[in-house]
Interface confidence: low
């Protein structure tokens, strides 16, 4: 025998105790398929959620988020706070992207700039907190007269390669010397600070700009989870 309830369409429910009839869903409930024995309670879009589509007898209400928030999860089950471009949401709220990362949206996390050198390219436009770097042609392509079709190599002077090599070695040596000098300088300063503390009346107590910047930027510790900040669940 066919179950009479199977004749009940969406928007109704069937109850064998009520003469096996298809009763309309009560207010604030719905059934999206036929043959249901109960109607489901309509979703209510409250607080940070706002109604995008009203509930009807055959379909649930649909919510989205109030301005300043965006949807997360299936069917907008959560609303997450928007941040500005160049920021990401952490447990402590919106934080600027760390140097070397960017976010060009109001949501999501800061992503590292593209490493142009991995593709053998050079940086054409520097990255910012809001924008990724723009990679340009590879450094070799930037030499004067470079074209897609390589012309025959011009005859070079015998000393040319040697000059380039000498210049490269000189620059490298200068850089290394500078690094050694800076390291020594810091070591000497540390030693003086330990030996003669009275010379420094307020030894580095004032928060430096660098420290403030570190606090304001969102470089996450490994234990700090993504998301979870500024989220509202339905």
């Amino acid at each position: 025998l066919q179950d009479p309830c199977s004749n009940c369409p969406a928007g109704t429910f069937c109850d064998n105790n009520r003469n096996q009839i298809c009763s309309p869903c009560p207010p604030n409930s719905f059934s999206s398929a036929g043959g249901q024995r109960t109607c489901d309670i309509c979703r209510q879009c409250k607080g940070v959620f706002r109604t995008r589509k009203e509930c009807s007898s055959t379909s649930n209400a649909e919510c989205d988020c109030t301005p300043g928030f965006h949807c997360l999860g299936a069917g907008c089950s959560m609303c997450e706070q928007d941040c500005k471009q160049g920021q990401e949401l952490t447990k402590k709220g919106c934080k600027d992207c760390c140097f070397g990362t960017f976010n060009d949206q109001k949501r999501g996390i800061c992503r590292p700039w593209t490493n142009c050198s991995l593709d053998g390219k050079s940086v054409l436009v520097n990255g910012t907190k809001e924008r990724d770097v723009v990679c340009g042609p590879s450094p070799a392509d930037l030499s004067p007269g470079a074209s897609s079709v390589t012309p025959p190599a011009p005859a070079r002077e015998p000393g040319h390669s040697l000059q380039v090599l000498t210049l490269f070695l000189a620059l490298t040596s200068a850089l290394l010397l500078a690094l050694i000098f800076i390291t020594l300088l810091f070591s000497v300063l540390k030693w003086i600070r330990k030996k003669f503390p009275h010379i420094f009346k307020q030894p580095f107590k004032k928060t430096t700009g660098a420290a403030q910047e570190e606090d304001a930027c969102s470089c996450r510790c490994p234990q700090e989870e993504e998301g979870g900040g500024g989220g509202y669940e339905l």
Partner: antibody, heavy 119, light 106 residues
Framework: QIQLVQSGPELKKPGETVKISCKAS????????MNWVKQAPGKALKWMGW????????TYADDFKGRFDFSLETSATTAYLQINNLKNEDTATYFC????????????WGQGTLVTVSA | ENVLTQSPAIMSASPGEKVTMTCSAS?????MHWYQQKSSTSPKLWIY???KLASGVPGRFSGSGSGNSYSLTISSMEAEDVATYYC?????????FGGGTKLEIK
């Protein structure tokens, strides 16, 4: 052929009680809700409510709560409408109607019972 | 309560004329049903689920509409169509009928 046969016309005085019957035949009585509809002279149809013939549970529209009673005699496949403490405004034709599973429509109606309330 | 308002309350049409009557619901309904009632008789289901003709209803009748606004149309009026037509909603408690449109012939 499915039939709903109602009792004859009634002439009553204000304050009295009337009980109208609606005898069902040629279908399983307890499978279908029985509804009552009022129609005052020259006026529109007005749904009064219904009785669940399976459980005996009545449901009344707001305007018909208090003096109106729906009841059943399942063995006789008969539904009843009783109106207590009759008033002049109860003068009307009362119809019983079988409600289908779906849609919620009335295909089968009784012939109607005219109740006249007059001093 | 979902109030159904029918218009016009009374109308007359000549044989062969097209007739349209409307029913406006105070709250949106999924379907509208229509009954025909001739004097001193029980109402007859005429159109159900907005546009489906009940058994025995002539093809000149049609129904349409959605949400809050529905209509019944007779493509070509005939003498036997003289009656009062009631719209009816069964989408929620209390079930309600419209005030009726009385159709006369010129």
């Amino acid at each position: 052929q499915i039939q709903l046969v109602q009792s004859g016309p009634e002439l009553k005085k204000p304050g009295e009680t009337v009980k109208i019957s609606c005898k069902a035949s040629k279908f399983t009585f307890t499978n279908y809700g029985m509804n009552w509809v009022k129609q005052a002279p020259g006026k529109a149809l007005k749904w009064m409510g219904w009785i669940n013939t399976y459980t005996g549970e009545p449901t009344y529209a707001d305007d018909f709560k208090g003096r109106f009673d729906f009841s059943l005699e399942t063995s006789a496949t008969t539904a009843y409408l009783q109106i207590n403490n009759l008033k002049n405004e109860d003068t009307a034709t009362y119809f019983c109607a079988r409600r289908e599973y779906y849609p919620w429509v009335f295909v089968y109606w009784g012939q109607g019972t005219l109740v006249t309330v007059s001093a | 309560e979902n109030v159904l308002t029918q218009s016009p309350a009374i109308m007359s049409a000549s044989p062969g004329e097209k007739v349209t009557m409307t029913c406006s619901a105070s709250s949106s309904v999924s379907y509208m049903h229509w009954y025909q009632q001739k004097s001193s008789t029980s109402p007859k289901l005429w159109i159900y689920d907005t546009s489906k003709l009940a058994s025995g209803v002539p093809g000149r009748f049609s129904g349409s509409g959605s949400g809050n606004s529905y209509s019944l149309t007779i493509s070509s009026m005939e003498a036997e169509d003289v009656a009062t037509y009631y719209c009816f909603q069964g989408s929620g408690y209390p079930l309600t009928f419209g005030g009726g449109t009385k159709l006369e012939i010129k």
